[in-house]
Interface confidence: low
């Protein structure tokens, strides 16, 4: 790695997987084992993430970008860039401090993680329950009754949504 | 990441469908939103859409928008486009904390 | 409807020094902490600081607080830096699949 030639910051020119060595008189040097510097002109390298435990590790570190980590089986991440591993539930149930418990009646959870939700009120807009909720499915809602005089061309509901595949925040 | 298309320049009343399309990760895992942002103004939430396709919209947005998925998109139809709907769209993901947003999309609603 | 305040519009502080900004919600929020706060630059997407009320987004510094519970929330920035300067908006979640995003407050920093 040559010396820099910036007659303003000596560092700028430093690329990415390399930090501006002080102690060697500015030189660029390599990021050292487990860093890595994103952006160039940086005077140190970060300290890659590491994923131990329930993390596993979904992309490596380099030089130039930071190790991602997702969640082992039977958990799932949260927060941005998964700082924390949850555990799943079933659809239909929640995470409490208890461990997973099933919605209460009214509510639903088609995911693996969240929180159970209340149906939707279909009344709130005026149409009738076209399908009824469970705890793992919202309510689908219809036309309004007074769509449905006899005579009426029936409606056919939807079919049952697959499972959701799952790895989410 | 997450990257929304289709806006442009369109006239008052000409439906018009944004997507969203991710890089990264998988679509069909997520719950999705839709929230825009007129010129110099604050966000306004439009609607989000199940990781099983149930679609539910802010009071304000229901008839005005639709929000659909494919396995590997989200859409939003903008149903009959007013003036009052110029904005930058967003898509973003997560139900209780949107972690990603994509970059945004203009959406310009002019006679 | 439900209605998120933002009571200031703007606030200011040094470098160093601490805002906090305030949101009360007209309803309860969902389960008391389905709050969530983000940081928007201009030109920019919104970046997520907070979820659960008070939970840290990965990546954001710990001098980001979120507080509160039920209708009264409040984001705390500490150790105020330049690049701090930006507009926050919270954003509630309720019954129903509903969201609404406060009016925003910008923060300024001297």
């Known amino acids: 790695f040559e010396r820099t030639r910036s007659l303003q910051d000596p560092c700028s020119n430093c690329p990415a997987g390399t930090f501006c060595d002080n102690n060697r008189n500015q030189i660029c040097s390599p990021c050292p084992p487990n860093s890595f510097s994103s952006a160039g002109g940086q005077r140190t390298c970060d300290i890659c993430r590491q994923c131990k435990g329930v993390f596993r590790t979904r992309k490596e570190c380099s030089s130039t970008s930071n190790a991602e980590c997702d969640c082992t089986p039977g958990f799932h991440c949260l927060g941005a860039g998964c700082s924390m591993c949850e555990q799943d539930c079933k659809q239909g149930q929640e995470l409490t401090k208890k461990g997973c418990k099933d919605c209460c009646f009214g509510t639903f959870n088609d995911q693996k993680r969240g929180i159970c939700r209340p149906w939707t009120n279909c009344s709130l807009d005026g149409k009738s329950v076209l399908v009824n909720g469970t705890k793992e499915r919202d309510v689908v809602c219809g036309p309004s009754p007074a769509d449905l005089s006899p005579g009426a061309s029936s409606v056919t509901p939807p079919a049952p949504a697959r499972e959701p595949g799952h790895s989410p925040q | 990441s997450l990257e929304e298309s289709g806006g442009r320049l369109v006239t008052p009343g000409t439906p018009l469908t944004l997507t969203c399309t991710a890089s990264g990760f998988s679509l069909s895992n997520y719950y999705m939103n839709w929230v825009r942002q007129a010129p110099g103004k604050g966000l306004e939430y439009i609607g989000i859409?199940?990781?099983?396709?149930s679609a539910y919209y802010a009071s304000w947005a229901k008839g005005r928008f639709t929000i659909s998925r494919t396995s590997t998109t989200v859409d939003l139809r903008i149903t009959s486009p007013t003036t009052e709907d110029t904005a930058t769209y967003f898509c973003?993901?997560?139900?209780?904390?949107?972690?990603?947003w994509g970059q945004g999309t203009l959406v310009t609603v002019s006679s | 409807a439900q209605v998120l305040t933002q009571t200031a519009s703007s606030v200011s502080a040094p470098v160093g020094g601490t805002v906090t900004i305030s949101c009360q919600s007209s309803q309860t929020v969902y389960n008391n902490n389905l709050l969530s706060w983000y940081q928007q630059k201009p030109g920019q997407r919104p970046k997520l600081l907070i979820y659960?009320?008070?939970t840290l987004a990965f990546g954001v510094p710990s001098r980001f607080k979120g507080s509160g519970s039920g209708t009264e929330f409040t984001l705390t920035i500490s150790d105020l830096e330049c690049d701090d300067a930006a507009t926050y908006f919270c954003q509630g979640g309720y019954s129903g699949w509903i969201y609404v995003f406060g009016g925003g407050t910008e923060v300024e920093v001297k």
């Open positions: 659960y009320a008070s």
């Open positions: 859409i199940s990781s099983s396709g």
């Open positions: 973003a993901r997560g139900d209780y904390g949107m972690d990603l």
